[in-house]
Amino acid sequence: PPNRRTCVFFEAPGVRGSTKTLGELLDTGTELPRAIRCLYSRCCFGIWNLTQDRAQVEMQGCRDSDEPGCESLHCDPSPRAHPSPGSTLFTCSCGTDFCNANYSHLPPPGSPGTPGSQGPQAAPGESIWMAL
């Protein structure tokens, strides 16, 4: 379809780099959530940091190209990196408007499919880009 994809846009304070240039921020009449219309893909992404007690959103926005996973209708995150001991970054890609607003589910920390404690370690800023 020719219509462009629109995604939720968010970048947590302290996250290095930005995906803002991958789209055009929209005026939605409300402060949050912000919306971004993708320029180079029809695909949204989301990154959440899962610790023992909670999941915290790190980034949401547009991908720079359509890749495997972008055909998903919903955000089904998968584990990607360990920014620090006891926390895991989960990412999703999906291809419907605002599909990255929230995830359908997150596996509990340490469950099958989650990288073990010996998984890749990264400095806080770098871990986001590893996840992307």
Partner: antibody, heavy 117, light 111 residues
């Protein structure tokens, strides 16, 4: 300041391939932006042909999709247009343009390409 | 493809006149209340020059006598008091849907 300059043959024979180069100065084509080709027919109508993005992905006008290729040489900060099987209807002024958003803020001066035997 | 129809195709004006050009789209060019319609000015032998983006935002360096308005399918470019350097051809462009398309142009001539 972003500057763009088109270059290439001004005359192409029918059925051959039109090849143009856009040289970008003042900005790296891998930093940001979509790098577009737009043409203007003798009747003054404008047509967006396609782009190559800073990351190398491409998007083409479906009306040209079977004939158009846009590529780049990042070491020379250039991007290219190839349009195959040209006819007289492809005679136009060809512009390269840079766009941070979905409108075109930066344009080259344009180069006239005539398709004729 | 979205077809953009500009009217009039040409007009004559005197310096100081208020000039209004319209652009009608074959379908809405809005996304969640944001209008993806843009306006350009072109003089002979030059490339188009961006004037207005997203319906009503004035590009940096463009005089305030230029303004844009509209939403959905109907858009207007207004020159509040036309100056000698404004005699040119004006184009609208939509970017709400691929492929991007342009209007046929409106030539503003000196009366």
């Amino acid at each position: 300041q972003v500057q763009l300059q088109e270059s290439g043959p001004g005359l192409v024979k029918p059925s051959e391939t039109l090849s143009l180069t856009c040289t970008v100065s003042g900005y790296s084509i891998t930093s940001d932006f979509a790098w577009n080709w737009i043409r203007q027919f003798p009747g003054k109508g404008l047509e967006w042909m396609g782009y190559i993005s800073f990351s190398g992905s491409t998007s083409y006008n479906p009306s040209l999709k079977s004939r158009i290729t846009i590529s780049r040489d990042t070491s020379k900060n250039q991007f290219f247009l190839q349009l195959s099987s040209v006819t007289a209807e492809d005679t136009a002024v060809y512009y390269c343009a840079g766009s941070r958003y979905s409108w075109f803020a930066y344009w080259g001066q344009g180069t006239l390409v005539t398709v004729s035997s | 493809d979205i077809v953009l129809t500009q009217s009039p195709s040409s007009l004559s004006a005197s310096v100081g006149d208020r000039v209004t050009i319209t652009c009608r789209a074959s379908e809405s060019v809005d996304t969640y209340g944001n209008s993806f319609m843009h306006w350009y000015q072109q003089k002979p032998g030059q490339p188009p020059k961006l004037l207005i983006y997203r319906a009503s935002n004035l590009e940096s360096g463009i005089p305030a006598r230029f303004s844009g308005s509209g939403s959905g399918t109907d858009f207007t470019l207004t020159i509040s008091s036309v100056q000698p350097e404004d005699f040119a051809t004006y184009y609208c462009q939509q970017s709400n849907e691929d492929p991007y398309t342009f209007g046929g142009g409106t030539k503003v001539e000196i009366k």
